[in-house]
């Protein structure tokens, strides 16, 4: 009875186990009892990344600059081209088929993690003691100014969007306080 299974780098055809083609090559003709599988290298701008029996190689991905894409890694006969986004943009999906502008963190929010070619900016609300008064894709929350270290006093309390306002100490109150 003919075989029903083959080893991993083989495939079943016409009751025969034939060798698969190596990565970077496509199938031209199946093996016979007396001839080996015939394979041919993929052409320029084509690839196959596994042991295979494909009769056509896959086209390398095109990194379309109109979509904000650029080549991160050029494809070979065994690997696809890897696209990434232009500076200031990031991929919309894992496959990186298009790009969107990095998000900015609004006032009251700071950058927790700066965006990369594949991930967007991550913002966080400024906690008590910190503020951000700008919309930015880079700025973290800044700590409120410490008036005391400058020998000043808080004239206006800070918020998550504004720094504290420091002012000179009231000398009279300062004098009474010490006596």
């Amino acid at each position: 009875e003919p075989p029903t299974a083959c080893r991993e780098k083989q495939y079943l055809i016409n009751s025969q186990c034939c060798s698969l083609c190596q990565p970077g090559q496509k199938l031209v003709s199946d093996c016979t009892e007396f001839t080996e599988t015939e394979c041919l290298p993929c052409g320029e701008s084509e690839f196959l990344d596994t042991w295979n029996r494909e009769t056509h190689c896959h086209q390398h991905k095109y990194c379309d600059p109109n979509l904000g894409l650029r080549v991160q890694q050029k494809g070979t006969s065994e690997t696809d081209t890897i696209c990434t986004c232009e500076e200031g943009w990031h991929c919309t999906s894992e496959a990186c088929e298009s790009c969107v502008l990095h998000r900015s963190c609004s006032p009251g929010f700071g950058v927790k993690q700066i965006a990369t070619g594949v991930s967007d900016t991550i913002c966080e609300p400024c906690p008590v003691g910190f503020f951000s008064n700008v919309s930015s894709a880079f700025e973290k929350c800044h700590p409120w100014t410490s008036c005391e270290t400058k020998d000043l006093v808080v004239q206006q309390a800070g918020t998550n969007k504004t720094d504290v306002v420091c002012g000179p100490q009231d000398r009279l109150r300062h004098h009474h306080h010490h006596h």
């Epitope: 075989p3 083959c6 080893r7 991993e8 190596q22 093996c31």
Partner: antibody, heavy 127, light 107 residues
Framework: EVQLLESGGGLVRPGGSLRLSCAAS????????MNWVRQAPGKGLEWVSY????????DYADSVKGRFTVSRDNSKNLLYLQMNSLRAEDTAVYYC????????????????????WGQGTMVTVSS | DIQLTQSPSSLTASVGDRVTITCRSS??????LAWYQQKPGKPPKLLIY???SLEGGVPSRFSGSGSGTDFTLTISSLQPEDFATYYC?????????FGQGTKLEIK
């Protein structure tokens, strides 16, 4: 050091069952296809069964089909052979053997061979 | 199933002799053939794969040739440690099969 070590052999009555184990070490077991091969006393080699690296594909010699089951646990680096409905003619030394795929520019289609063998475990089926 | 027939079944030779063992397949198997050496009480040892490629660490006095249905294993100059039993095996398709073996004995 690359090694295979069989265990679980012994004396069993006809119709009985036995489970052989093969412990692999020194290589990434889960990346290799494996086989069981047996040798009856004073006789030649007989291929018994095959299992793919994932365990998804198995095959058997006609003489054991329906009675023997090959399996593997890649997390424990173990290969098994469950032998049921044993017969006197199953008496043999059982070897586990690693399938290797050789591939280079001089051999673009590659070639298989069994490059690592255990020392074997004896199975005797007798009443 | 593919049958492999080895000849001779046994062979007596002397140290330094050139020895050839043949293996014939019942159907074409291209170059999907391996040769093994086995000594008493020991597991087989792979010598040749793909009909003609020498396994690493195997002395160059061993060579294999053939494709399709007819294969040969040649030992160019027998050494004392070469006296053993030799098996061919087809890995073309399942069930994988072995030849019946050739016992090489010292004269």
């Amino acid at each position: 050091e690359v090694q295979l070590l069989e265990s679980g052999g012994g004396l069993v009555r006809p119709g009985g069952s036995l489970r052989l184990s093969c412990a692999a070490s020194g290589f990434t077991f889960g990346s290799y296809e494996m086989n069981w091969v047996r040798q009856a006393p004073g006789k030649g080699l007989e291929w018994v069964s095959y299992i793919s690296s994932s365990g998804e594909t198995t095959d058997y010699a006609d003489s054991v089909k329906g009675r023997f089951t090959v399996s593997r646990d890649n997390s424990k680096n173990l290969l098994y052979l469950q032998m049921n409905s044993l017969r006197a003619e199953d008496t043999a030394v059982y070897y586990c053997a690693r399938d290797v795929f050789f591939f280079d520019s001089s051999r673009p289609n590659g070639a298989y061979g069994m490059d690592v063998w255990g020392q074997g475990t004896m199975v005797t089926v007798s009443s | 199933d593919i049958q492999l027939t080895q000849s001779p079944s046994s062979l007596t030779a002397s140290v330094g002799d050139r020895v050839t063992i043949t293996c014939r397949s019942s159907q074409g198997i291209r170059s999907s053939l391996a040769w093994y050496q086995q000594k008493p009480g020991k597991p087989p040892k792979l010598l040749i794969y793909g009909a003609s490629s020498l396994e690493g660490g195997v002395p160059s006095r061993f060579s294999g040739s053939g494709s399709g249905t007819d294969f040969t294993l040649t030992i160019s100059s027998l050494q004392p440690e070469d006296f053993a039993t030799y098996y061919c095996q087809q890995l073309n398709s399942f069930p994988s099969t072995f030849g019946q073996g050739t016992k090489l004995e010292i004269k």
